[in-house]
Interface confidence: low
C-alpha cells in the first residue's frame, strides 16, 4: 500500500494565531485529531469537507482541527492571538509568484501580460470555452483569476475580457525571480521552499525524514519559519533539508540581488588594525598565521582544496591571502601554504579592546579619553577642529577644547548615549562610537520613572479654531511599505522625518520602501485622494540597543487636513501612572487579512516596578522603556503595528511617548506592553533633526 504523503510543508504556519469569522455566512468544519499533520493531510485532499480547504487551525489544547474555506487574506475574517492555536494557510493561495509552470498557482492576479482584464471562468462572455469550474475540480477556477489548470508551458493564463483577444498568459513571476539574497544569504528571510533540483524542503520544526539540530526554538534569530530555505551555518548560499529520504539537504536557487551588499543589521564592525569580537569584520592585511607561516590565496586551490572562495563568499572580502573570518570561527584564519598544515588562526592580530587603551566609558562618557576614532558603522572620525562650527550650532556652551584632540571619539555635548564623532560623510554627519559602558558602571538615571518630575508636554497648546482643536485626526500615522505591502507603522514627527522601529527594515535597499501618509485604509485602493506616497532617502539607526530608527523622507511631507506631525515629549520626562494612552496600527497585514482600516487600542500608563510585577518579575525595565497596560483584555499592539506610536495626552497636547517594537508578545492578557520610551531618546532625535540635512521640497 502506498504511504500517504505528509502535506504539512504545503502550509505557512502562524504560531499562536487563529482566524475569527466576522461574516457568519462563512462555513467551517471541526474534528478531534492528534496532530497538525492530520489536519494538513485532510485539508490538502479536501476529504469529507463541503468546501475547498484553504487553511486550518490546530487547537493544541483541545486536540482539534478547524478547517476553513478562507484564509487570512479573505474578507469577513480577522486574525486573533491565542496561545493554544496554530494557524496553517495553504501557500498556494497566498503566493504571488509561481513555481515551474504555475499549475498550483491559486493567487488573485486577474490581468494578462498586456494589461487586459481576465474574463470570469464561469462566464461565456465574450469567449465561449469548456474550462468550467465544475469540470476542473481542485484547479480553483474561481472569479477571473489567472490559472494553469492543464499545466501548459506558458504558465497561468485566462480568457480575456477583450473580444479580440481570446486568451493570454498572465505576467506572474517565478518565485525564484521574485526574491533575491545578498552575500551568502545569511540574512535571507524569503519564502523559497524548494531546492534547486525541485525537491520540497522539510519543515525546520520537523525531524522527519531527516533529524537535525536546527530547531526554531533553539535558534530564534535564524528565521526558521515553515520550510523556507535558510543559511544558518555559513554555507555559500541558502539550503534546506529535503523531503526526499535519500537527499539529506540541497542548496536552493535564489538569485543574488543587484545591490549585493549586506543588511545594516548584519554588517560586522569593520576594523583594519585589530579584531573586534570574533574578527568577522577584520579587513586588514595580515597574511600569516600565528607562527609566521604564510597564508594560501583564497582564490587558489593549492596546496589545499576548499570552497571558501571569493565567489562563494561574496561579502567576506576574501582578497589576496589576508586573514579573514568568513564562517564565524573564533577568530580570523586562513589556509596555509604549508601542505601539512591545512588551516591556522591569525591570533597575533591584537584585540581592539586592548589596542585602544581606555575601551569603555563611565556615566555618559563625557570624560572618555580613549583613542578610538571609528564610528559604529566603520567610518573614520574626522578632526574635531574641522567641525567646531557644527558643534557650536547644537550646544549652548563652550566645549572643552583640551578634550577634543585629533579625531578621537568624545562626548562634548553631554549626549546621553555615549561618545561620538563627526565623520566627514555628508550623509552621516556624525555617529556614535562602538564603545561600551565599563563593567559595573550603573546606567545614569534621568529621573525616578514612577514619580513624575518633568512634564512631558511642552508649554505650547494646540491652536484652537472656533473651539475645535485642529488636526484631531491621526494624520501623523505612517504606513511603511516594503515592496508595495504594509510592513510597519511610524510617526511623522517632522515634515521630513518618521520615527519607527529598526526591525521594520528587512532589506538594505531603500528603493524597497515607501511611506504612505494621510491614509486610514492600508489597502492599495485608488480612491484615496488624501494619500501622500513618499520615498525613503535615509535610515538613521538609534543609539545602541534602542531599536529606534529615524527614517528620512526623500522630500518633505505636505502638511494638510490629512497629514500632520505629532509632538515629541521633553527629554527625560515621565507621565503619571494611569494616564490614558492609545496605540495605533494596521495590524499584521503581510497577508492583507482584514478591512485594512487603522485600529486603535486604549492603554494606560503603568509604572516600571508594577509593570515588572505583572511580568512575574521576569522582565526588569530600564529607563529606556515605558509600560502600558490594556483597558480591554487582550488588546494591544502586534506584528505589523511595529514602529507605530504609543500616544498620550498631557495638558491638551498629544505626544508620541512610546514606539512599538517586537519581542514582548502580542496583546497577552494581564501582561502590559513594553515600549521604547521616546522621552529617553528625545535629545538624540532632536540632534539628528538638527544636524542631518533635509531634502528641499
Amino acid at each position: 500500500q502506498r504511504k500517504r504523503r505528509n502535506t504539512i510543508h504545503e502550509f505557512k504556519k502562524s504560531a499562536k494565531t487563529t482566524l475569527i469569522k466576522i461574516d457568519p455566512a462563512l462555513k467551517i468544519k471541526t474534528k478531534k485529531v492528534n496532530t497538525a499533520d492530520q489536519c494538513a493531510n485532510r485539508c490538502t485532499r479536501n476529504k469529507g469537507l463541503p468546501f475547498t480547504c484553504k487553511a486550518f487551525v490546530f487547537d493544541k489544547a483541545r486536540k482539534q482541527c478547524l478547517w476553513f474555506p478562507f484564509n487570512s487574506m479573505s474578507s469577513g475574517v480577522k486574525k486573533e492571538f491565542g496561545h493554544e492555536f496554530d494557524l496553517y494557510e495553504n501557500k498556494d493561495y497566498i503566493r504571488n509568484c509561481i513555481i515551474g509552470k504555475g499549475r498550483s498557482y491559486k493567487g488573485t492576479v486577474s490581468i494578462t501580460k498586456s494589461g487586459i482584464k481576465c474574463q470570469p471562468w464561469s462566464s461565456m462572455i465574450p469567449h465561449e470555452h469548456s474550462f468550467l469550474p465544475s469540470s476542473y475540480r481542485g484547479k480553483d477556477l474561481q472569479e477571473n483569476y489567472c490559472r494553469n489548470p492543464r499545466g501548459e508551458e506558458g504558465g497561468p493564463w485566462c480568457f480575456t475580457s477583450n473580444p479580440e483577444v481570446r486568451y493570454e498568459v498572465c505576467d506572474i513571476p517565478q518565485c525564484s525571480e521574485v526574491e533575491c539574497m545578498t552575500c551568502n544569504g545569511e540574512s535571507y528571510r524569503g519564502l523559497m521552499d524548494h531546492t534547486e533540483s525541485g525537491k520540497i524542503c522539510q519543515r525546520w520544526d520537523h525531524q522527519t525524514p531527516h533529524r537535525h539540530k536546527f530547531l526554531p526554538e533553539r535558534y530564534p534569530d535564524k528565521g526558521f519559519d515553515d520550510n523556507y530555505c535558510r543559511n544558518p551555518d555559513g554555507q555559500p548560499r541558502p539550503w534546506c533539508y529535503t523531503l526526499d529520504p535519500h537527499t539529506r539537504w540541497e542548496y536552493c536557487a535564489i538569485k543574488t540581488c543587484a545591490d549585493n551588499t549586506m543588511n545594516d543589521t548584519d554588517v560586522p564592525l569593520e576594523t583594519t588594525e585589530c579584531i573586534q569580537g570574533q574578527g568577522e569584520g577584520y579587513r586588514g592585511t595580515v597574511n600569516t598565521i600565528w607562527n609566521g607561516i604564510p597564508c594560501q590565496r583564497w582564490d587558489s586551490q593549492y596546496p589545499h582544496e576548499h570552497d571558501m572562495t571569493p565567489e562563494n563568499f561574496k561579502c567576506k572580502d576574501l582578497r589576496e591571502n589576508y586573514c579573514r573570518n568568513p564562517d564565524g570561527s573564533e577568530s580570523p584564519w586562513c589556509f596555509t601554504t604549508d601542505p601539512n598544515i591545512r588551516v591556522g588562526y591569525c591570533s597575533q592580530i591584537p584585540n581592539c579592546d586592548m589596542s585602544h587603551g581606555q575601551d569603555c566609558y563611565r556615566g555618559n562618557g563625557k570624560n572618555y579619553m580613549g583613542n578610538l576614532s571609528q564610528t559604529r558603522s566603520g567610518l573614520t572620525c574626522s578632526m574635531w577642529d574641522k567641525n567646531m562650527e557644527d558643534l557650536h550650532r547644537h550646544i549652548f556652551w563652550e566645549p572643552d577644547a583640551s578634550k577634543l584632540n585629533e579625531n578621537y571619539c568624545r562626548n562634548p555635548d553631554d549626549d546621553a548615549h555615549g561618545p561620538w564623532c563627526y565623520t566627514g560623510n555628508p550623509l552621516i554627519p556624525w555617529d556614535y562610537c562602538p564603545i561600551s559602558r565599563c563593567e559595573g558602571d550603573t546606567t545614569p538615571t534621568i529621573v525616578n520613572l514612577d514619580h513624575p518630575v518633568i512634564s512631558c508636554a511642552k508649554t505650547k497648546q494646540l491652536r484652537v479654531v472656533n473651539g475645535i482643536p485642529t488636526r484631531t485626526n491621526i494624520g501623523w500615522m505612517v504606513s511603511l511599505r516594503y515592496r508595495n505591502k504594509h510592513i510597519c507603522g511610524g510617526s511623522l514627527i517632522k515634515e521630513s522625518w518618521v520615527l519607527t522601529a529598526r526591525q521594520c527594515f528587512p532589506s538594505r535597499d531603500l528603493k524597497d520602501y515607501e511611506a504612505w501618509l494621510g491614509i486610514h485604509d492600508v489597502h492599495e485602493r485608488g480612491d484615496e485622494k488624501c494619500k501622500q506616497v513618499l520615498n525613503v532617502s535615509q535610515l538613521v539607526y538609534g543609539p545602541e540597543g534602542s531599536d529606534l530608527v529615524l527614517m528620512k523622507l526623500a522630500r518633505p511631507a505636505v502638511l494638510d487636513d490629512f497629514v500632520s506631525t505629532i509632538d515629541l515629549p521633553n527629554y527625560g520626562c515621565t507621565i503619571p501612572e494611569k494616564t490614558s494612552c492609545s496605540v495605533y496600527g494596521w495590524g499584521y497585514t503581510g497577508l492583507i487579512n482584514y478591512d485594512g482600516l487603522l485600529r486603535v487600542a486604549h492603554l494606560y500608563i503603568m509604572g516600571n516596578e508594577k509593570c515588572s510585577q505583572h511580568h512575574r518579575g521576569k522582565v526588569t525595565l530600564n529607563e529606556s522603556e515605558i509600560c502600558a497596560g490594556a483597558e480591554k483584555i487582550g488588546s494591544g499592539p502586534c506584528e505589523g503595528d511595529y514602529g507605530g506610536p504609543l500616544v498620550c495626552e498631557q495638558h491638551k497636547m498629544r505626544m508620541v511617548l512610546g514606539v512599538i517594537v517586537p519581542g514582548r508578545g502580542c496583546a497577552i492578557p494581564n501582561r502590559p506592553g513594553i515600549f521604547v520610551r521616546v522621552a529617553y531618546y528625545a535629545k538624540w532625535i532632536h540632534k539628528i533633526i538638527l544636524t542631518y540635512k533635509v531634502p528641499q521640497s
Epitope: 492576479v109 486577474s110 490581468i111 498586456s114 482584464k117 477571473n144 473580444p163 505576467d171 508595495n484 528603493k511
Partner: antibody
Amino acid sequence: QVQLKESGPGLVKPSQTLSLTCTVSGGSISSGVYYWSWIRQHPGKGLEWIGYFYYSGNTYHNPSLKSRVTISVDTSKNQFSLKLSSVTAADTAVYYCARDRSGYDHPDAFDIWGQGTMVTVSS
Amino acid sequence: DIVMTQSPDSLAVSLGERATINCKSSQSVLFSSNNKNYLAWYQQKPGQPPKLLIYWASTRESGVPDRFSGSGSGTDFTLTISSLQAEDVAVYYCQQYFSPPWTFGQGTKVEIK
C-alpha cells in the same frame, strides 16, 4: 509633488530615429504603484497613446505603431525614454510623457502629464 | 482596438449655462467584477497638457471644481459642466483604459456663446 519633463531634439530627419527622455522628479520611477506612458498629439488633432512601461520591466505599445517603438528606463537617473524609428512627416507631433496610478491590479487614468515637447520631422 | 466617439465636435454655451458632452465606446468598458467603468475625462487648454478631471467615469479628481461631473455606464458616458465659467473654455477628451491600447475620443471644443 511629482513632475515630468520631456526633453529631446525638436527636429528629426525622415527615416531617422526620434529619441525623447522623460525625467521624473519628486517621486521614484521604481514605485510599484505607477505605469509610465508616452502619448502624442498631432498638430490641431486628438491624442494618441504610444505605449507604457512598468518598473518591473513590462512594456506594451500601440500596435498601430508596429515595431517602431522602444520604451526603456534608467532607474538610476529616474528617467524613461522613447525611441521611434523610421520616422516620417506623419510623426510630427507634441510628445507627452504621463503617469497613471495603475499599480499591479488594474489600469487607471493619467493623473500627471509633462508639459510636452514639439517634434518636427523634416529634411 | 476600442474606438471612442465624442459628440458634438464643438459646443457653444452661454456663461452660467449647462454644457453636456457625450462619449460612446465601441465596446463596454464596464468590468463586472468590480462594477467600475474604465473611462476618464480630460480638459486641455491651448499650449497646455491635458488635465485629468474625472476617472472611473464619475469620480472627480481632487482639486476639480464640483461643477464638473461624469455619468454613464457600459458604452455611453456624459461629461456635464453644470454652470459654464470663462476658464472652462477648452477641448475635452474622453479616454478608455479598459483594454490596451488605451484610446481617446477625438475631442469636443467648448466655447462661450
